[in-house]
């Protein structure tokens, strides 16, 4: 839960030629109020809803008489904030309508008369919790200077209004697996407490009291394990009784975008992809131009091209779609190499990168052997971030310091006895057996078992061993 | 009628910079980008970059963006584009052009660089 | 950045014959693509936008046509005016980029 906040700033004639006439006069005073609609920017109801997050309207301002033959000037304002209470998360994502009205003060029949002067609106990325930010809207020839936050109401805390802070229990820290509340840090996070008895390994929830299924799992307490096999179709609302999916129309069936947008499934509901010039859940908001703010996560909005697109967005590294509103998953391109991991800090990729490689992408092989001796005539070896000798007859270990006893694994089959040589070592083999590491056992009648031709050899070839 | 009128041709040295105008007409000229375009002597086309001049925005193509830097004066509904450290590779005919469906684009203004 | 890649890079056609002219993109613009026609000395002249609009005042024997990375321009039947250098723009992404042109001459 938390509060969103409105400050006008001014309500006035914009820049440019073409000022437009004041509202009131002498004959007809009048006075202005602000009405703000707000719509969560991504949701499913900010198409039908009118205003799924909240409204506000403003209290009256000063009664304002124009002064003859004097331009508009920014005209008198109500005092005070427009706040608009949310109960749930904060979006993140939202879009907002502000409307200026002017309350006709003069004699009419039936007391005020009201009429809309200007109408704003625009999509915003906002994080609760954040600094006020300031904005500047134009509509027709009237200038609006505003800004607006998102607050959380305590016990919320965070981004979104959905972690909870109560205050310490213990004076030294906080519960197991539980923060400290940043910037309370004499308060902890609260535990999330889920509906009674929803399951823990297949349901969760995002406010208290509730109870979500992962997908598979159904039921009231995400008990009930999803089971198609008697069902004729694999989507649909899920029966509580028997746990099966009901046959039912595809989030994209009939396809829901509209102006030509493409529709895509995801896990809880669809995704329009819209063409440019049109943005919305559905696609269905258009007329826009680079005056509403099309542009999302720092986008720059220049003009279309089409004219059935008054503006396109330049996104920045790191965004994309026609409104710069999707995340591009640049590791998903897996920009690293040689086993570097991958993090994506938003305004950069950053690889961290195995031992032994170095680089932006962990391009780069580190020289292994780098200042790494090997003793006794061994040579280094490089690979995979480490280094290894391969060592000279005679010698082991790491560096090849040690001196190796060659007979040390046995290497002599069939009783042969092993002697340590200058070049390796010799089999003295048993009555009965020859060969190099005497393998081979010899036959009465003086014919040996020996293979009909061993690797690299021809029948008939002279076969020598030690 | 849409109109846009460019600076005269140019002559400059290797190393100087220069400053080419295109001044539209006939359209209301914060509505729509005005786009700037080079095409060297047998050549192609080349995009340079745009400037948007309801807000200012500039989008450069990024193999101009240390020669070129585009400017808009609103006042006089005029577009500039100033093109620095001049070597003989800049030589080329440059369009000012609102690169939209009507498509309408200035005469090209001539610059040879040489010493 | 996009690349264009324009063909034939020169035609010589008779007159009344159909000539067709091909772009194709590395990757798809959504047809974000238009045509232009540039005679010797002159600015070019938008032909077509959006891959197959024409442009007011331009003759119906041009036309345009494709989706994804294969587009087409066609003159249906030549005329002596229609010659010069033709080249396609894409404006899908920036940086927008140009085809390499194709000169067309009478035979």
């Known amino acids: 839960a938390g509060v969103f906040e409105l400050q006008i700033h001014s309500f006035g004639p914009g820049p440019g030629p073409g000022a437009p006439r004041s509202p009131c006069s002498a004959r007809l005073p009048c006075r202005l109020f602000f009405r703000v609609c707000l719509k969560p920017g991504l949701s499913e109801e900010a198409a039908e809803s009118p205003c799924a997050l909240g409204a506000a309207l403003s209290a009256r301002g000063p009664v304002y008489t124009e002064q003859p033959g004097a331009p508009a000037p920014d005209l008198p304002l109500p005092d005070g904030l427009l706040q608009v209470p949310f109960r749930d998360a904060w979006p993140g994502t939202f879009s907002f309508i502000i409307e200026t009205w002017r309350e006709e003060l003069g004699d009419q029949i039936g007391g005020p008369a009201w009429s809309l002067l200007a109408r704003v609106a625009g999509r915003r990325r906002l994080a609760a919790g954040g600094p006020w930010a300031r904005d500047i809207q134009r509509a027709g020839a009237w200038e609006l200077r505003f800004s607006y936050r998102a607050r959380c109401e305590p016990p919320a805390v965070g981004t979104a209004c959905t972690r909870l802070c109560r205050p310490r229990s213990a004076p030294s820290r906080c519960g197991p697996g539980l923060r400290p509340c940043a910037p309370l840090e004499d308060e902890c996070e609260a535990p999330l407490v889920c509906r009674a008895g929803c399951s823990p390994e297949h349901g969760f929830c995002e406010q208290p009291g509730e109870c979500r299924c992962l997908e598979g799992w159904t039921g009231p307490l995400c008990t009930v394990p999803v089971s198609t096999s008697s069902c004729l179709s694999p989507r649909g609302p899920s029966s509580a009784t028997t746990g099966c999916l009901v046959p039912g129309p595809g989030p994209c069936d009939g396809n829901p975008c509209a102006n030509g947008g493409s529709c895509s499934e995801t896990p809880r509901s669809f995704e329009c992809t819209c063409p440019r010039g049109f943005y919305g859940l559905r696609c269905e908001v258009s007329g826009v131009t680079c005056a509403d703010g099309p542009c999302f996560n720092g986008g720059l909005c220049v003009g279309g091209a089409d004219p059935d697109s008054a503006y396109i967005c330049h996104c920045p590294p790191g965004f994309q779609g026609s409104n710069c509103e999707k995340r591009v998953d640049r590791c998903s391109l897996q920009p690293c190499r040689n086993g570097g991991l991958c993090l994506d800090l938003g305004h950069a990729l950053r690889c961290r990168c195995r031992a032994g490689f170095a680089g932006p992408r962990c391009e780069h092989d580190l020289d292994d052997c780098a200042g790494r001796a090997c003793a006794n005539g061994g040579t280094c070896v490089e690979g995979g971030g480490a280094h290894r000798c391969s060592c000279a007859l005679g010698f082991g270990g790491r560096d090849c310091r040690e001196r190796a006893d060659p007979c040390a694994a046995r290497p002599c089959a069939h009783g042969g006895r092993c002697y340590a040589h200058f070049s390796g070592l010799v089999c003295a083999c048993a009555p009965g057996y020859m060969g190099a590491r005497c393998e081979f056992p010899v036959h009465p009648d003086g014919a040996s078992a020996l293979p009909a031709a061993p690797p690299g050899l021809r029948p008939g070839d002279p076969q020598r061993y030690l | 009628e849409v109109q846009f009128q460019q600076s005269g041709p140019e002559l400059v040295k290797p190393g100087a910079s220069v400053k080419i105008s295109c001044k539209a007409s006939?359209?209301?000229?914060?509505?729509?980008?005005i786009h700037w375009v080079r095409q060297s002597q047998g050549k192609s086309l080349e995009w340079i970059g745009l400037?948007?001049?309801?807000?200012?925005?500039?989008v450069y193509n990024q193999k101009f963006k240390s020669k070129a830097t585009l400017t808009v004066d609103n006042s006089s509904t005029s577009a500039y584009m100033e093109l620095r450290s001049l070597s003989s590779e800049d030589s080329a005919v440059y369009f000012c052009?609102?690169?939209?469906?009507?498509?309408?684009w200035g005469q090209g203004s001539t610059l040879i660089v040489s010493s | 950045d996009i690349k264009m890649t324009q063909s034939p890079s020169s035609i010589y056609a008779f007159l009344g014959e159909r000539v067709t002219i091909t772009c194709k993109a590395s990757?798809?613009?959504?047809?974000?693509l238009s045509w232009f026609q540039q005679k010797p000395g002159k600015s070019p002249k938008t032909l077509i936008y959006?891959?197959?609009r024409l442009v007011g005042g331009v003759p119906s024997r041009f036309s345009g046509s494709g989706s994804g990375q294969d587009y087409s321009l066609t003159i249906s039947s030549l005329e002596y005016e229609d010659v010069g250098d033709y080249y396609c723009?894409?404006?899908?992404?920036?940086?927008?980029?140009f085809g390499g042109g194709t000169k067309l001459e009478i035979k």
């Open positions: 052009a609102r690169l939209n469906w009507e498509g309408y």
């Open positions: 006939g359209y209301t000229f914060t509505d729509y980008n």
């Open positions: 400037i948007y001049p309801f807000n200012g925005g500039i």
């Open positions: 990757q798809d613009i959504n047809s974000y």
């Open positions: 959006r891959a197959n």
């Open positions: 723009l894409q404006y899908a992404e920036f940086p927008y980029t």
